[in-house]
């Protein structure tokens, strides 16, 4: 007349080495496993009863140890991976728009000795700022007197009037903004005179894009004469190095 080995629990372990058989009336003591602590008033022992079964322990009296509460960082949020601060869990940090994280994005609640502690210090959310954007030759940008630019602040470049008969063209993005990595969204543009040669075609003629002169991004369309076919593209664009792209087509019989 005996009980078999006592039941095992996730959060508790026997205080003594288990035996294969226990006499009726024999009692075993449990203790909380590492990382768990006792939560009174639940029992922590079990008895081998006359039916040769162990008297049940209705609720586990041990609960996981928890790391201390970490509030939301200023200008950000702390999000628990599965709703509790108990060890083995993770705390994720995100910053509001316009702020970036300094420190670890994830903290882990882990055991150190018998205590549950966070894997590091909570991060902080710092305002995103950009240095003033580059100055450019033959042009300027808005807010040129501002020293510090915040997230999504934008500046717009424009070209100066040219000293000669041909204007400066703005090559690149005219508007750039302060990005979340504290860098500007694009390189500063360039202001320079871009003028393509007059697009002449033999055995054909221009049918669209007429102009006095052909500056940056000017587009010209050609048509062949009767009995000829176009070699190349009928549409060309003046590119930033003052050449036609694709080149001026030819017309052949």
């Amino acid at each position: 007349d005996a009980c078999g080995p006592p039941p095992t629990f996730e959060a508790m372990e026997l205080t003594s080495k288990p035996k294969p058989y226990y006499k009726v009336g024999e009692q075993v003591e449990y203790d909380c496993k590492k990382g768990y602590h006792h939560f009174a008033p639940f029992l922590t022992h079990s008895i081998c009863d006359r039916n040769h079964t162990w008297l049940p322990i209705s609720d586990e009296p041990c609960v996981k140890k928890v790391c201390h509460y970490i509030p939301n960082p200023l200008h950000g949020e702390a999000i628990l991976a599965n709703g509790s601060y108990s060890f083995g869990n993770q705390l994720h940090f995100i910053c509001n728009d316009g702020y970036y994280l300094i420190g670890k994005e994830i903290l882990y609640c882990e055991l150190k000795g018998s205590d549950a502690v966070w894997s590091g210090r909570p991060p902080i959310c710092q305002k995103i700022v950009c240095k003033p954007p580059p100055k450019i030759n033959n042009g300027k940008h808005t807010f040129s007197d501002v020293e510090v630019f915040e997230y999504l602040d934008a500046v717009t470049y424009s070209c100066d009037p040219a000293p000669g008969p041909d204007p400066f063209s703005l090559i690149g993005e005219s508007t750039i903004y302060c990005r979340d990595n504290s860098l500007w969204s694009d390189d500063a543009p360039e202001c320079k005179v871009v003028k393509c040669r007059f697009p002449v075609i033999e055995n054909g003629k221009q049918i669209a894009g007429f102009g006095k002169k052909f500056y940056y991004k000017a587009t010209v369309i050609f048509e062949r004469d009767k009995g000829f076919h176009i070699i190349g593209s009928d549409t060309i664009v003046c590119n930033s190095n003052s050449t036609w792209d694709p080149p001026v087509p030819k017309c052949a019989k």
Epitope: R197, F198, V200, K205, Q206, F210
Partner: antibody, heavy 119, light 107 residues
Framework: QVQLQQSGPELVKPGASVKLSCKAS????????INWVKQRPGQGLEWIGW????????KYNEKFKGKATLTVDTSSSTAYMDLHSLTSEDSAVFFC????????????WGQGTLVTVSA | GIQMTQTTSSLSASLGDRVTISCSAS??????LNWYQQKPDGTVKLLIY???SLHSGVPSRFSGSGSGTDYSLTISNLEPEDIATYYC?????????FGSGTKLEIK
């Protein structure tokens, strides 16, 4: 200022050839195209063709292909036009004129060279 | 090629007059038209390019206008040094072609 100095008058026999010159000064020679224009006595102007000194590319009036050959010598900033197999129809004043970036208007002209074809 | 016609081969005007010289193209030339002046001594000058743009150094009494096939050069206040032959030139299509010229004389 831009100046184009053309060579002096030529008296040539029918069937012969002649080489006219146009020396440019006052600007960067390779920046402008050189055009050649013909004017028969008491007549209007006829465009012969152009040459781009920077890369030696050229365009001719179909009518003058085989009659005129355009060349340049960038070292002396001089443009040349060779006229071949001359006939009395080629008796004319020949002008050189510059145009910028291939834009076909001619802001600066030489004084002209008179070519007379006569036996 | 495109034919350029200057129907008036010569015209007389008095000093101070407003003079208009016409030029028509055998097909539309989309404002790709220039005007030149040739003095009696043979020297040639560009006056107007792209229909109405005044070349630098040209007096403002010269102006150009037109569209499609019909173009004109106007001298608003005729001066003695304007005595010359005036040529139009198209450049929409190769070969570039000139009008036959209009000779301007003083009455």
């Amino acid at each position: 200022q831009v100046q184009l100095q053309q060579s002096g008058p030529e008296l040539v026999k029918p069937g012969a050839s002649v080489k006219l010159s146009c020396k440019a000064s006052g600007y960067t020679f390779t920046n402008y195209d050189i055009n050649w224009v013909k004017q028969r006595p008491g007549q209007g102007l006829e465009w012969i063709g152009w040459i781009y000194p920077r890369d030696g590319s050229f365009k001719y009036n179909e009518k003058f292909k085989g009659k005129a050959t355009l060349t340049v010598d960038t070292s002396s900033s001089t443009a040349y036009m060779d006229l071949h197999s001359l006939t009395s129809e080629d008796s004319a004043v020949f002008f050189c004129a510059v145009s910028e970036d291939g834009y076909p208007w001619f802001p600066y002209w030489g004084q002209g060279t008179l070519v007379t074809v006569s036996a | 090629g495109i034919q350029m016609t200057q129907t008036t081969s010569s015209l007389s005007a008095s000093l101070g007059d407003r003079v208009t010289i016409s030029c028509s193209a055998s097909q539309g030339i989309s404002n790709y038209l220039n005007w030149y002046q040739q003095k009696p001594d043979g020297t040639v000058k560009l006056l107007i390019y792209y229909t109405s743009s005044l070349h630098s150094g040209v007096p403002s009494r010269f102006s150009g206008s037109g569209s499609g096939t019909d173009y004109s050069l106007t001298i608003s206040n005729l001066e003695p040094e304007d005595i010359a032959t005036y040529y139009c030139q198209q450049y929409i299509k190769l070969p570039f072609t000139f009008g036959s010229g209009t000779k301007l004389e003083i009455k």
